[in-house]
């Protein structure tokens, strides 16, 4: 599990690559509040 925006699916990365898009470090994080601590 990852909630700090470091995670992006390979599928999304692949789609962006094939479409000529640029993968940036601003992926939307999963919802922090739905995780306990």
């Amino acid at each position: 599990a990852c909630d700090t925006a470091t995670c992006v699916t390979h599928r999304l990365a692949g789609l962006l690559s094939r479409s000529g898009g640029v993968v940036k470090n601003n992926f939307v994080p999963t919802n922090v509040g739905s995780k306990a601590f």
Partner: antibody
Framework: EVQLQQSGPELVKPGASVKMSCKAS????????MHWVKQKPGQGLEWIGY????????KYNEKFKGKATLTSDKSSSTAYMELSSLTSEDSAVYYC????????WGQGTTLTVSS | EIVLTQSPTTMAASPGEKITITCSAS???????LHWYQQKPGFSPKVLIY???NLASGVPARFSGSGSGTSYSLTIGTMEAEDVATYYC?????????FGSGTKLEIK
């Protein structure tokens, strides 16, 4: 094994500042946000805020804005909390806690503010 | 901010007894944002239940959680001596995240 090792107890004078640390090990530091929680002696838990170590993004409880500053150091997998303009009301145990449903908390840092 | 009101504040139970602690929220929240913690005297808190009903790793099956909207509960099926602790609910629906004021569980 995941561990959160917090710095030792602090005795500081009113008006001073203090910076406490929370060293993480056993997991990828940048993959979980780190929460900070305050507990006064004999009282309940109060959420201060969290830091995202990946990009140093923070979210604060409005009550602690201007009092607490959260930072992190990816190279040492350490989260920090600095508390400023200390008063007796800041005397408490402060915990860091890793987000993720797996229940990892530091052992707590006891802060005593006294002249 | 969302205020979480726990009931009772303190209670004493006999070993084997069934215990229910309630947590009432001042605004409706989705169950995925409601968590329960246990804090034994002198120790850090630990998560018991996450997302209202999911048992955290290593937590005995006698603990369970339920609820929705503004009303949530934590149940201990059969009280044991090691369950003496303070229990807190916590919401992550809106910032600031907030905790209930705690329920102190003692043994008779």
């Amino acid at each position: 094994e995941v561990q959160l090792q917090q710095s030792g107890p602090e005795l500081v004078k009113p008006g001073a500042s203090v910076k406490m640390s929370c060293k993480a090990s056993g997991y990828t530091f940048t993959r979980s946000v780190m929460h900070w929680v305050k507990q006064k002696p004999g009282q309940g838990l109060e959420w201060i805020g969290y830091i995202n170590p990946y990009n140093d993004g923070t979210k604060y409880n409005e009550k602690f804005k201007g009092k607490a500053t959260l930072t992190s150091d990816k190279s040492s997998s350490t989260a920090y909390m600095e508390l400023s303009s200390l008063t007796s009301e800041d005397s408490a145990v402060y915990y860091c806690a890793k987000s993720g449903n797996d229940g990892y908390w530091g052992q707590g840092t006891t802060l005593t503010v006294s002249s | 901010e969302i205020v979480l009101t726990q009931s009772p504040t303190t209670m004493a139970a006999s070993p084997g007894e069934k215990i229910t602690i309630t947590c009432s929220a001042s605004s409706s929240i989705s169950s995925i944002y409601l968590h329960w913690y246990q804090q034994k005297p002198g120790f850090s808190p630990k998560v018991l239940i996450y997302r209202a009903k999911n048992l955290a790793s290593g937590v005995p099956a006698r603990f369970s959680g339920s609820g929705s909207g503004t009303s949530y509960s934590l149940t201990i099926g059969t009280m044991e001596a090691e369950d003496v602790a303070t229990y807190y609910c916590q919401q992550g629906s809106t910032i600031p995240f907030t905790f209930g004021s705690g329920t102190k569980l003692e043994i008779k």
